[in-house]
């Protein structure tokens, strides 16, 4: 199950948006989603991996169909490895992880 | 500069419950999580459970029964609370920040708890 | 539970030697392992953290390697203020769990 995960950090460098969508993948019914994330010391490594431990992200549905999820405040030069989980009764499934550093993408002001 | 300071009874009889605060400062309660460990005397550290910034618990399952973790994020306090013990849970117990999700950084010195009738 | 083997116990160098010691994680824990010196009476503090990066302040004859399942901390040049105990830690998953500790003497 490959969910795209994009992030942006704003010009003041103050939080880092991630928003994604599952409007590719089909027969989600009675599955639920959510944001898991591991912050690292330090930067991505090269081969991002799924952490044991992590924590969820409250995500939140737009408007256009994707979820949005606000990091506020932001450790810019600390990885940020990030998936979405799909729990079902029979199961859970984790999409392959991204690892995303805030300082690399800050959208200029 | 990151700060923590453990404050406990120093005594607990057995089968009462251990309470312990510690006060945080030079970081944030919601950014980073906070772990507790104990160190029985002259042995080695061991991990009883965490509570991280976005709020969630997770504990050592040979305490989980009867350990809680919560905190007062206006105060800057994070709590451990453990029930029932025994002259076993003599130890020096101490909180740690974590770095991210990641290694525990900084330690407080600790809070002595003997347990003892 | 992840266990984390760590040898020797005890170790008496003398000043200006080099010493080595080592944990061995029972399963793959990548890089996740953090070095503490833990000195008498004092908390621990931690030395080096994801397996071989110095912790702010830390001198450099303190070196960390490894990964996967072995790990080695060296202490280059033994200074007096070296007598301490060191702790190896994983934190790949839960539960975090310490190597037993190696107590470090001076003769």
């Known amino acids: 199950v490959n969910i795209n995960i994009s992030c942006e950090t704003d010009g003041y460098l103050t939080k880092m948006t991630c928003r994604w969508s599952t409007s590719t993948i089909q027969s989600l019914a009675e599955s639920t989603l959510q944001l898991r994330y591991h912050r690292s010391s330090l930067y991505c490594s090269d081969i991002p991996s799924i952490h044991p431990i992590s924590e969820p992200k409250d995500c939140y549905l737009q408007s256009d169909g994707f979820y949005e999820c606000i990091f506020q405040p932001i450790f810019l030069l600390s990885g940020y490895t990030m998936w979405i989980r799909i729990n079902h009764s029979l199961g859970s499934l984790d999409s392959p992880p991204t690892c995303v550093l805030p300082d690399s993408v800050v959208k200029p002001l | 500069q990151v700060k923590l300071l453990e404050s406990g009874p120093g005594l607990v009889a057995p089968s009462e419950s251990l309470s312990i605060t510690c006060t945080i400062s030079g970081f944030s309660l919601t950014d980073d999580g906070v772990s507790w460990i104990r160190q029985p005397p002259g042995k080695g550290l061991e991990w009883l459970g965490v509570?991280?910034?976005?709020?969630?618990?997770y504990f050592n399952s040979l305490f989980k029964s009867r350990l809680s973790i919560t905190r007062d994020n206006s105060k800057s306090q994070v709590f451990l609370e453990m029930d029932s013990l025994q002259t076993d849970d003599t130890a020096m117990y101490y909180c740690?920040?974590?770095?991210?999700?990641?290694?525990?950084?900084?330690w407080g010195q600790g809070t002595s708890v003997t347990v003892s009738s | 539970e992840l266990v984390m083997t760590q040898s020797p116990k005890f170790m008496s160098t003398s000043i200006g030697d080099r010493v080595n010691i080592t944990c061995k994680a029972t399963q793959n824990v990548r890089t996740a392992v953090t070095w503490y010196q833990q000195k008498p009476g004092q908390s621990p503090q931690a030395l080096i953290f994801?397996?071989?990066n110095r912790h702010t302040g830390v001198p450099a004859r303190f070196t960390g390697s490894g990964s996967g399942t072995d790990f080695t901390l060296t202490i280059n040049n033994v200074k007096s203020e070296d007598l301490a105990d060191y702790f190896c830690?994983?934190?790949?998953?839960?539960?975090?769990?310490f190597g037993s500790g190696t107590k470090l003497e001076i003769k």
């Open positions: 994801l397996a071989s």
């Open positions: 740690a920040k974590h770095d991210g999700h990641e290694t525990m950084d900084y």
């Open positions: 830690l994983q934190h790949w998953n839960y539960p975090l769990t």
């Open positions: 509570i991280w910034g976005g709020g969630s618990t």
